[in-house]
């Protein structure tokens, strides 16, 4: 990969091992856990990153109300099965043969079942709502400055095409970033909104996935934007299928 040529590292993914063992002795970086070669000029898929994380050695309302079908990732970390493209397989199972269906960002979208559970297709998450609360500041941020800074961040740091950042809402101290990307809109080479959101989430938590870069230093007109809480909602092209018991719990 040209991005990794000089000193054989992967700028966009620190969860890799790079070696001059590619064709012609070129640098090749493979994701930990899966062993899949990754493209270091762009973001690595969330599935491969989660797998790498699990395998790494243990060291007036302008705000959007999430739809009733919005999913939150309550299950936390698991060791996912990724397909040869690096995407989540539609059905995930744990070591005890408990299985469930996931969406394209790896979030569970059905009740848990056994090995007989069928997940016919990987349902695409087409709308992601990132809900942030920032630490108290002297005054509110200017909305248009905040909007511009967050759009710049997603464009430059995560290489997400600007058309996929649908909106930035602000009602102090809550910021909401809406990412939208339908299957038909996503062209070859486009960063997936799910991958961009995952990189952003890790950055916000101070767990940057980028190699050797400093952590995320978000500033709006020189004023630090420090996030104290993050919630991410995922909306799928097909609504999730949970039992009524879960919905009323």
């Amino acid at each position: 990969h040209t991005a990794a040529q000089d000193n054989c590292t992967c700028p966009t993914n620190k969860m890799t091992v790079c070696s001059p063992d590619g064709p012609g002795g070129r640098c090749q970086c493979r994701a930990l856990g899966s062993g899949m070669a990754v493209d270091c000029s762009t973001l690595t898929s969330k599935c491969l990153l989660l797998k790498a994380r699990m395998s790494a050695p243990k060291n007036a309302r302008t705000l959007v109300r999430p739809s009733e079908h919005a999913l939150v990732d309550n299950d936390g970390l698991y060791d996912p099965d990724c397909d040869p493209e690096g995407r989540f397989k539609a059905r995930q199972c744990n070591q005890t043969s408990v299985c469930w269906c996931v969406n394209s960002v790896g979030v569970r979208r059905t009740d848990k079942g056994d090995l007989s559970l069928r997940c016919d297709e990987l349902v695409r998450t087409h709308h992601i709502l990132i809900d942030l609360r920032h630490r108290p500041t002297a005054g509110a941020f200017n909305h248009s400055d905040l909007d511009a800074e967050l759009r710049r961040l997603f464009r430059e740091r995560y290489r997400l095409h600007p058309k996929f950042v649908a909106a930035v809402h602000y009602e102090q101290p809550t910021i909401q970033i809406e990412l939208r990307q339908n299957t038909s809109q996503k062209a070859a080479g486009d960063v997936d909104i799910g991958d961009a959101a995952y990189y952003f989430e890790r950055d916000i938590k101070g767990e940057s996935l980028f190699q050797g870069r400093g952590g995320l230093d978000l500033r709006v007109r020189g004023e630090p934007l420090q996030v104290e809480r993050t919630l991410i909602y995922y909306l799928d092209e097909i609504p999730p299928k949970f039992s009524m018991k879960r919905l009323t719990a």
Epitope: S19, Q28, G35, V38, P84, E85
Partner: antibody, heavy 116, light 113 residues
Framework: QVQLVQSGAEVKKPGASVKVSCKAS????????LGWVKQAPGQGLEWIGN????????NYNEKFKGKATITADTSTSTAYMELSSLRSEDTAVYFC?????????WGQGTLVTVSS | DIVMTQSPDSLAVSLGERATINCKSS????????????LAWYQQKPGQPPKLLIY???TRESGVPDRFSGSGSGTDFTLTISSLQAEDVAVYYC?????????FGQGTKLEIK
């Protein structure tokens, strides 16, 4: 030139352990993946696992977890694979190999025979 | 795991004739990031370690005679020996090194007819 030289043949009793070595020379040992492959008599090839000596990352084929333990000593450019609780079905030739798209370098193989 | 299936299991070809071995994988071996197929072909003679012939589905390893060629992409691959020589008698294996665990085909035994 790149060379991988493995330790000699071993005969072991069931239940015993064996440690096979693979000494690398002719390249920088720490920056290439090194894998281990099993070939039972008259059978095909099975990938056991690999190690990246520079950072000691190790991957195992699920089938060999608990059976094989892969390690490396960077000071001597030597990789090791220990097989535990030997049974007759562990009788095989074990190869080490430098991995990669164009890494056609294999050790000569080590025959491990398990017999009572 | 990715399952590699070779056909035929054995093959007898006359000297100077073309030999063709097929390999089918249960999942695509094409990496969309770099458009590389993670498929290698090995030749193994009795009492010897496997010898790398082809990597990346179609790139010949240095020193390998040009009568050996590899083709295919995704899930279907072919090793072709354009004009069989006596020294080509061996067992041939395809291998995926796309995603762990790396897997080999069951092997194809090539003999002289």
């Amino acid at each position: 030139q790149v060379q991988l030289v493995q330790s000699g043949a071993e005969v072991k009793k069931p239940g015993a352990s064996v440690k096979v070595s693979c000494k690398a020379s002719g390249y920088t040992f720490t920056i290439y993946w090194l894998g281990w492959v099993k070939q039972a008599p008259g059978q095909g090839l099975e990938w056991i696992g690999n190690i990246f000596p520079g950072s000691a990352y190790i991957n195992y084929n699920e089938k060999f977890k608990g059976k094989a333990t892969i390690t490396a000593d960077t000071s001597t450019s030597t990789a090791y694979m220990e097989l535990s609780s030997l049974r007759s079905e562990d009788t095989a030739v074990y190869f080490c190999a430098r991995e990669g798209s164009n890494s056609g370098y294999w050790g000569q193989g080590t025959l491990v025979t398990v017999s009572s | 795991d990715i399952v590699m299936t070779q056909s035929p299991d054995s093959l007898a070809v006359s000297l100077g004739e073309r030999a063709t071995i097929n390999c089918k994988s249960s999942q695509s071996l094409l990496n969309s990031g770099n458009q590389q197929n993670y498929l290698a072909w090995y030749q193994q003679k009795p009492g010897q370690p496997p010898k790398l012939l082809i990597y990346g589905a179609s790139t010949r390893e240095s020193g390998v005679p040009d009568r050996f060629s590899g083709s295919g992409s995704g899930t279907d691959f072919t090793l072709t020996i354009s004009s069989l020589q006596a020294e080509d008698v061996a067992v041939y294996y395809c291998q995926s090194d796309h995603i762990y665990p790396y897997t080999f085909g069951q092997g194809t035994k090539l003999e002289i007819k």
